[in-house]
Each structure stands twice: as C-alpha cells, then as structure tokens.
Interface confidence: low
Amino acid sequence: FSGDGRAIWSKNPNFTPVNESQLFLYDTFPKNFFWGIGTGALQVEGSWKKDGKGPSIWDHFIHTHLKNVSSTNGSSDSYIFLEKDLSALDFIGVSFYQFSISWPRLFPDGIVTVANAKGLQYYSTLLDALVLRNIEPIVTLYHWDLPLALQEKYGGWKNDTIIDIFNDYATYCFQMFGDRVKYWITIHNPYLVAWHGYGTGMHAPGEKGNLAAVYTVGHNLIKAHSKVWHNYNTHFRPHQKGWLSITLGSHWIEPNRSENTMDIFKCQQSMVSVLGWFANPIHGDGDYPEGMRKKLFSVLPIFSEAEKHEMRGTADFFAFSFGPNNFKPLNTMAKMGQNVSLNLREALNWIKLEYNNPRILIAENGWFTDSRVKTEDTTAIYMMKNFLSQVLQAIRLDEIRVFGYTAWSLLDGFEWQDAYTIRRGLFYVDFNSKQKERKPKSSAHYYKQIIRENGFSLKESTPDVQGQFPCDFSWGVTESVLKPESVASSPQFSDPHLYVWNATGNRLLHRVEGVRLKTRPAQCTDFVNIKKQLEMLARMKVTHYRFALDWASVLPTGNLSAVNRQALRYYRCVVSEGLKLGISAMVTLYYPTHAHLGLPEPLLHADGWLNPSTAEAFQAYAGLCFQELGDLVKLWITINEPNRLSDIYNRSGNDTYGAAHNLLVAHALAWRLYDRQFRPSQRGAVSLSLHADWAEPANPYADSHWRAAERFLQFEIAWFAEPLFKTGDYPAAMREYIASKHRRGLSSSALPRLTEAERRLLKGTVDFCALNHFTTRFVMHEQLAGSRYDSDRDIQFLQDITRLSSPTRLAVIPWGVRKLLRWVRRNYGDMDIYITASGIDDQALEDDRLRKYYLGKYLQEVLKAYLIDKVRIKGYYAFKLAEEKSKPRFGFFTSDFKAKSSIQFYNKVISSRGFPFENSSSRCSQTQENTECTVCLFLVQKKPL
C-alpha cells in the first residue's frame, strides 16, 4: 500500500505525472477500451408502485421532503419502455450498460423471501436483451433506493442488521443473474448515502445533524460491501468468473498556494475525508485514514484487526465516480478553504499514487444541463470532451490503468435533490409525454462518434504539406499606428549660428554675431526612432512592412487648412529608409483602436463616423497621403478593421450600421480618388483590411449552430465585403435577418438603404482582399432581444477549454485560416488576397514558443490554401513588430526592443519561402528575390545620428 497522493500537489521535480503541456491530446484509447453508459433504477424506472414493487426510502422522501415533486412515477419510465432504452443503447454503440437493480422491486419489504415475479422478469429480460446485443451488463446492487420497510423497522443503514439482509439480497442476485453478469457494483457512492442521507438531510432518509450516525452508516456500508465481496469471492466467482467492486465518488481540489505546505496538507485532508474514508479500508490498508481517525476519534467507529484484514482488498478494480453529485452543493463539501476543481486527470493521478496504481473503471462521469435544454446540449459536449481528454491523457501520458468509462446518464430522469430541475441524460425525455420517446441529444451523437473512433482523431486538419510560396510573395510584419516624431532629434546642422559657451560664468550659450555657418538639409537619420524601426525590420528579414499613419497628427484640424509637414516627412522617411533595405511599405491611412478612435479632434467632436462629412474629410486626407507618399508606396490600406468599429459605436445597432455605412463610403471615395487621379502615374493598389476570424458551429450536431456560424461570417465579413467586392449593397442574408427580428419586435435596428448612386460608388472599390485573421470562434445560436449589433446577430461564443489558447484566450486553430480563404474565394471570386495581420499573444519575453507554434501551423494552412486550393494568396503579415507596454504581448520584440526567439523562426520560414522539401533548390532569380543587403544592414546599425 502506497498512500502517496499528496505528491500530486507538490509537483516535486522528480515526480511529474501530469504533463503540463497545454496541447489537447489527439489519440486513441487502448484497443479494448470499455465504453459504457449508466443509469440508476430510481432515476429512470418510474412505476414506483406498479406490479408489486414496494416503496423505497426515496419514494417516501419525495412525498415528505421534496416540494413540487409528486413522485418518480413520471420519470423516463424505463420499466415500461425497456425496448426504447435498448434502442438508445444500440444508437450509441456502447460496450456495456451500467444499471442498478431496485431492491424493493425484487423484494418489496427488503427481506429475501419469494421475489416479486414481475420485477424479476423485468431484470431478466433486460439482461437477456443486453447479452443478445453483445452489451456487457454492469449491475449495481444498491443505488440508494433502500426498501422503506427496512428503514422503518431497523433505522436503515444505521443498524448493522442491514448488513446481513443486504448480503442475502446480493446472494439472490448472484444466483439469478450471475450467469449473465460479469461486473458487479455493490453500492453506488456510499459517501453521499452517509453524508447527505444522515448528515445534511438532503438525501433520503433525510436525517441530519448527527455526525455519529453519519460515520456509523459509512461503517455499515463498508462492512456490507466487504461481506458481499467475500460472499461472491467464495461462492460465485469460481464458476461465474466475474469481478466485483464498489463505486466511490469524489471531488477534486487544488491548493490556494501551490508552494504552501499547509494548503497542500488541507487538500490531502479534503480528499482523504471524502474518497479516503471508503477507499482506505477497501483499497488501502483496511482501516480509516490516519487523519480521520485522529480528528474524528469520538464519532468514527473502530475496525478490529480481524475486520481490517477482512476489509482490505475487497475490490477487484477501482470504480470511480466523478460528477456533479460530489461537487454540489458546495457549502456542504470538505473544501478546507481550498479550490474545488474539475480536473479528473489529477484525481486519477491521486488514486494511482494513493492506492498503488489500481485498474480503474470510471463508473460515473458527466455533468448536467438546465432542465430547459432539450436536445441541443452544447455545453455537455464540451464537458464530455474535456473529461474524456483528461482520461486519455491520464492513460497515455501518466500511465494510469483506466480500462473503462461510463458516461452518465443514458436518459434524463429524476436527479435526487434536484428532482427534475436538471438533466443529465444523453437522450432527452419529455416527462410530460405519454410515449417518453428517447431523443438523442448532441452529446449522444458526440459520444457515439468518440466510441466509433475509439478516441479523438485529428480530422480537422490535413497533414502538413511541403512546398513553397511564390517568389513574389510578400513576407510582412505589421505595426499599428506610428506616432511621428514632432521634432527631429538632431537639430545641430539646421541652425546657421555659431555659439560660445560661457563655461565659467552663467553657463549659457552666447551667439557670436556676424558669423554664419553652412547648414545641411534635414535628413531621415535625424529621427531617432526610425533607426529603431529599421533595426527591428532588418532583423525580421521581411520584404514588407505594414504600418499606419496617424490621421490626427497629419491633419490636426481634420481638413487641409493645417498640414503637419513634419509628420509627413517622418512617414516618408520610414518608407524611403525601408526601401533602402529592400523592404516595401504597405501603408494604412486610418487605424482606429478600442481605446482611441484616432480621428482629428474637430471630426471627433462633430460626431465622428456618425457624421457623413467625416467620409469627405477622409477622402481629402487620403488624397494628401497619396500625393505625398504615393511615389514610394504601392500598397495602401484605407481603413483597418472598420468591421470592428462596432465595438465603439455600440450605443445602438443603428449607430453601428450608420458608422459602418460612412466608413464604407469613406473607403470608396478614397479608392475612386486614387483610381482617377493617382493610379495612372503611381500604379499602386488600394484596399481596406477586414477583421476576419473564422467561425465554426460550437455544436456540429445542431443545425442552428451551422447557421449561426455562417451568420457570424455574414455579419462580420460580408457586411463590408459584399458591398465592396460584389454587389454594392449589404448582404441579403444580413439585411433579411435584421429585418425579420425587426418585424418580430425583437430589435429596432435596420441596415441603411443604399441609393443606386451609393451602390455604384461602393461596388468594385478594392484592388485586392486584405484580411486580418487571428483565430476561429465557436459560435452558437441564441435568440437575443435588444437593438445592438451584438444582439442583432443572435450569436453567443463558446470557449473550448480543451484547445490551446493564448493568455487573452485566443484559440490556436490553424485550419480556420484555410477555411476562411476558401470561403472568401467561393463568395467573392478569385482575387489577390493578403493576410494583413495574423498573430497571437504570448507571455514569454524571450522564448515565445506559442508564437512559433502559431506561425508554423498557420503558415502551413496558408500554404495548403495556395498549393492545394489554388487561392491567390499574395502575402502574409505577422502581427506585430513590437509590443506595447501593459498590452497583450503580440510583438516579436518587447516594448524595450528586445528580440524574441520567434524572429529566428520567422526568418527561417521566409528564407525557405515556406516549408520546402529536403534539398529543394527552387531559388528565385535576383530580380525577384529581395536579397538582404549586408552593407545596408551594417550602415543601419552603425550610422551615427
């Protein structure tokens, strides 16, 4: 016996059973893994008085203690609809079905005399049907429904007389059913029987407050189990060759402070006082845990040496229950001031260490949904996915001997103290219906798929490809707004006067009259932070640099009456100095952010983008920039992520749609101006960049979620793409969806009606498609009332906790970018596409492994889109060059310009032009390839300012 569970929290360096990798494990379960599903008789059978069944303590408890619950008589009626249960089992494809026998259905008053024939027939028919279907029965003898007569006559489990009566009942079951049953469970979760039945009074028989009674009941349950095990072991195992255990339930707990010895001690005590209470005598040394014996000496019964010997080892495997009943209500739990956790993997590790690595059957696992949830139980899928992934990690990474898994439960039914207010079934049952049809929920479809694949297959993404991007591919890095230096940092050559320093007197400079020196023209090197920019860019080895101008700096008044020439000179310097390094600029004219709209003050005060005249002001500003920088800049972005301005103009949907309308017009005016006035001489290209995350249905088994995913793309991307790339008008699907909500009185929003002139103005005003893509969102349909953009969409987002995510909870889902590119091409035709921003936040200041993983995986998917899907992808701009202080860490450089290791990774991808085959020698000609200029780099680094 080992008893070393506390090591799980110490995380001592020599012991790391839990692999700390965040990555979800795509793998299969062992070949003969035992997949099952369970129910409890009282929860699903119904018919509490039918065919001679006697009342149980729960039938009585319901009538006396539970308000608003008439009986379990409604329930799912499994006693009547046996065939429907069998069909449900067939549907899922389980290897075993765990169910319990209702003791009072076989023996109405609990005493083993002549069994109730109808009850016997029911269980016999069920077992025969299971065997016929090759479904292994796992039979629980006692799942809380003690015959009421035994409670009233003997005081129930408080009286050790029950031990022998229970053994008689078990003997009968072994005799009648043992030929068809290879797995037996004596008692389901004895902790709850004792603690809630006699301590809190929340369970039948509803006694409370007597701690001595609680531990007496626990003692008798353990002894009853042990007696039955020995009975089976001696008299039935030799010819029936089955296995027998007891299902023990528990929570899991984490210390407040992982380094604190006292907190770890409390966590160990918490586990020991719940799971150890029963596991120690049965799976451990035969006695109660030492901590319990010391603390509860006045109320905890004592095992004699002979009894300890008798208790020890009375289970053929460890049957473990991990579900809501051990977690709620929280105020009755042995939390010891620590943090309750749903980490099943760690609980399994604790069992492994504490009880010497037993074979484990997860005999109950699952969560619950609100009773109003019918078949679309989306959160249940994710709870199951999380639990199953933890079990798989425990098996594969921690070498824990889990041999089977019981999903709980087959059917919606009576949920103990929660009665019918929650649902735990994988099949939905309408309790008010006559036929009690079993309708598969999404979780049933999901579990079925897991069983069919024996785990998690990596279906979402195709294998990595080897190949290269074209020679003219833009390898970029994106920066947000560059604030221009208002004064050049080196004015020493621009002042023609000579000065003498009065060093000994007043220490001032005195101008020498009559002397004029030669000045030199202003130089780009006068700006200090340009040097920093260039240093960083040179290290990135990119071919393109995307940055944004600050509209408010260039035109402080919002019109051309006051042009900040110094700001324009600064931006021209950034572009021209970059070109000397072989780095072309993609310039964004307007880059609003959450905190700052970036508009010139006068425009901001005149209602910003709610005012149509802002679009005209933008056109004038764009014209100035084209004129001043267009000879050097060949790629322009008018507005960055106008589809995200909804975050700012969110007082009402109509504000949002009005602002969006003016942004579209602003872009179109700028594009038309460039097309008419500047394109002939400058030959550049103009677009706007849209925030373009992909969307997947949170629940792939719910058609409403598929529609919500498409609707997300309509409201997020098509909202701007459709008018510009395609029709000149908003997407019909979006317009109709908002209108339909309007008609039903759920929203007062309406998309603006475009005139024919406006449609003509907007249509076709893009030279390429620019997308900012960061992640994939999991969306679900939820009807929302209200007149804001967010509620107009009827969409909620779901965070999948099993996925690799960043500190800001951006999920790393590489295949989403490929799906996005294909969707764009399918909807808007074959055009040049640039990914103008793509990246992830990573806490690491040096070895940013998450960013390297992200870049590698996302670029793989972009390459697949290029090579396999033939998408005309022209460039990828990683986001972003340098991080900003106290903002999420998206940068390749820290805010004080320290380089991170992802730079070298990106360098390597750029120099290879992707992921070429070994020994691939597909080089580009010198004219095509931007070769790095070593002298330029040297000059950039050494040039004195």
Epitope: K439, P440, S442, P700, A702, W706
Partner: antibody
Framework: QVTLKESGPVLVKPTETLTLTCTVS??????????VSWIRQPPGKALEWLAH???????SYSTSLKSRLTISKDTSKSQVVLTMTNMDPVDTATYYC????????????????WGQGTTVTVSS | SYVLTQPPSVSVAPGQTARITCGGN??????VHWYQQKPGQAPVLVVY???DRPSGIPERFSGSNSGNTATLTISRVEAGDEADYYC???????????FGGGTKLTVLG
C-alpha cells in the same frame, strides 16, 4: 458539379424484385453532411419518400414500405442501391434519387440536387 | 405519422402574388422545404429551412412558417412559374421524410 443518375430496369414483372442504382458525382458519400434519399412518383400523383441513407450508413425507411425496402451504399463506386421486393402494378412510377445535406446528424437542409428519374413499369 | 396538407390547386394572374400553404400540426416548430416540379422534370429545391433560398432561385420566391401553417410566396408571378409545388419536412420523431400532397400553380391568361 454535383450530379445523381438513376439506373435500373424499365420493366419489372409482378412479384419480382426491383434493384435501382444511383450513381453520384461531385461529392463523396462519406461526407459527414451528405445523405441520399429515394423518392418515387406514380403517374399524375404526388411525391412519395421511400428511404434515406446517412453518411455513417444509418438507414431510414418509409413505414408503409419498410418490409419491402433495402437501401445500401458502395462508397468506392459512389453508388447508392435501393431494392424493393414483391413488386406490384401499383408500384409503377418514376423513381428519383436525391442528395440531402444533413447538418449535424439529423437536420435536413432539403434535397438540393435530384437525379432526372427513371421510369419503372410493373406489368406481366 | 406526420401529415402535411396542401391545397390541390392555386390560380394567379401574371404579375400578381401567389401564396401556397402547407398545413401540419404545430408545423412552426419544424423546418419546411419547398420544391418546384415542372411537367416531365425532376423537382427543384426552391426554399429550404422555411425561408432560405438556394443560389440561382429568384428573390421572388420566399417562405414563412409559424403555428400550424407554412407558406410559399411567389411574388410577381411569371408564366414560367407554372408547376407543381411540394412542401416537405423531416419528422424527427419517426426519422422520416414527409411530403405534402402537392399544389398545382396555374398562371392565368
């Protein structure tokens, strides 16, 4: 381009078994969201659904004809086969196969592509 | 099993609006799909999920569904719209496809 094409005998004698084949192209029968239905239409009458096969090989049959129908698929040949036993003159009809897009298991988006139909006459 | 009831025929003048109904017990909670079938041709899906139009189907075709009635509306009817129209649902209880009896749309004149 997605197409479905029905093939089978033009004439069947009473009590014989009818075997119809639907050959599909432009999509895979393995695709998790695709299913195929058989529908028939007696001359001058309404459409009558017969059977459906899902991507995971689950099948569903019209209650009134269940005992006579079998639907199956051969993914490698891109074919769905319907057999109907004990044919009778009232089974004279045009038989269509149609693709159904099924999101997430059991939610029809309707039958978006149909074959041109094959006319079967039952007569001695 | 689930039954869908359609009127046998509907007549409408060119340029007017035709409404074809499909009745069923609480049909509003089901998804309804509509098909157009011209003589000698296979049916064509014109509306799915109550009101969505497949690509290539004119905007004149629209659908609605609530209570016990689903409706296919064809505005600005043209002579080429003359055909049989069928409604269809997927009955989740029985896992069956159910068609209505069909409605013959006649364009007058």
């Amino acid at each position: 381009q997605v197409t479905l094409k029905e093939s089978g005998p033009v004439l069947v004698k009473p009590t014989e078994t009818l075997t119809l084949t639907c050959t599909v192209s432009g999509f895979s029968l393995n695709n998790a969201r695709m299913g195929v239905s058989w529908i028939r239409q007696p001359p001058g009458k309404a459409l009558e659904w017969l059977a459906h096969i899902f991507s995971n090989d689950e099948k569903s049959y019209s209650t009134s004809l269940k005992s006579r129908l079998t639907i199956s698929k051969d993914t490698s040949k891109s074919q769905v086969v319907l057999t109907m036993t004990n044919m009778d003159p009232v089974d004279t009809a045009t038989y269509y196969c149609a693709r159904s897009v099924v999101t997430g298991g059991y939610y029809y988006e309707g039958m978006d592509v149909w074959g041109q139909g094959t006319t079967v006459t039952v007569s001695s | 099993s689930y039954v869908l009831t359609q009127p046998p025929s509907v007549s409408v003048a060119p340029g007017q609006t035709a409404r074809i109904t499909c009745g069923g017990n609480n049909i509003g909670s089901e998804s309804v799909h509509w098909y157009q079938q011209k003589p000698g041709q296979a049916p064509v899906l014109v509306v799915y999920y109550d009101s969505d139009r497949p690509s290539g189907i004119p905007e004149r075709f629209s659908g609605s569904n609530s209570g016990n009635t689903a409706t296919l509306t064809i505005s600005r009817v043209e002579a080429g719209d003359e055909a049989d129209y069928y409604c269809q649902v997927w009955d989740g209880n029985s896992d069956h496809v159910v068609f209505g009896g069909g409605t013959k749309l006649t364009v007058l004149g």
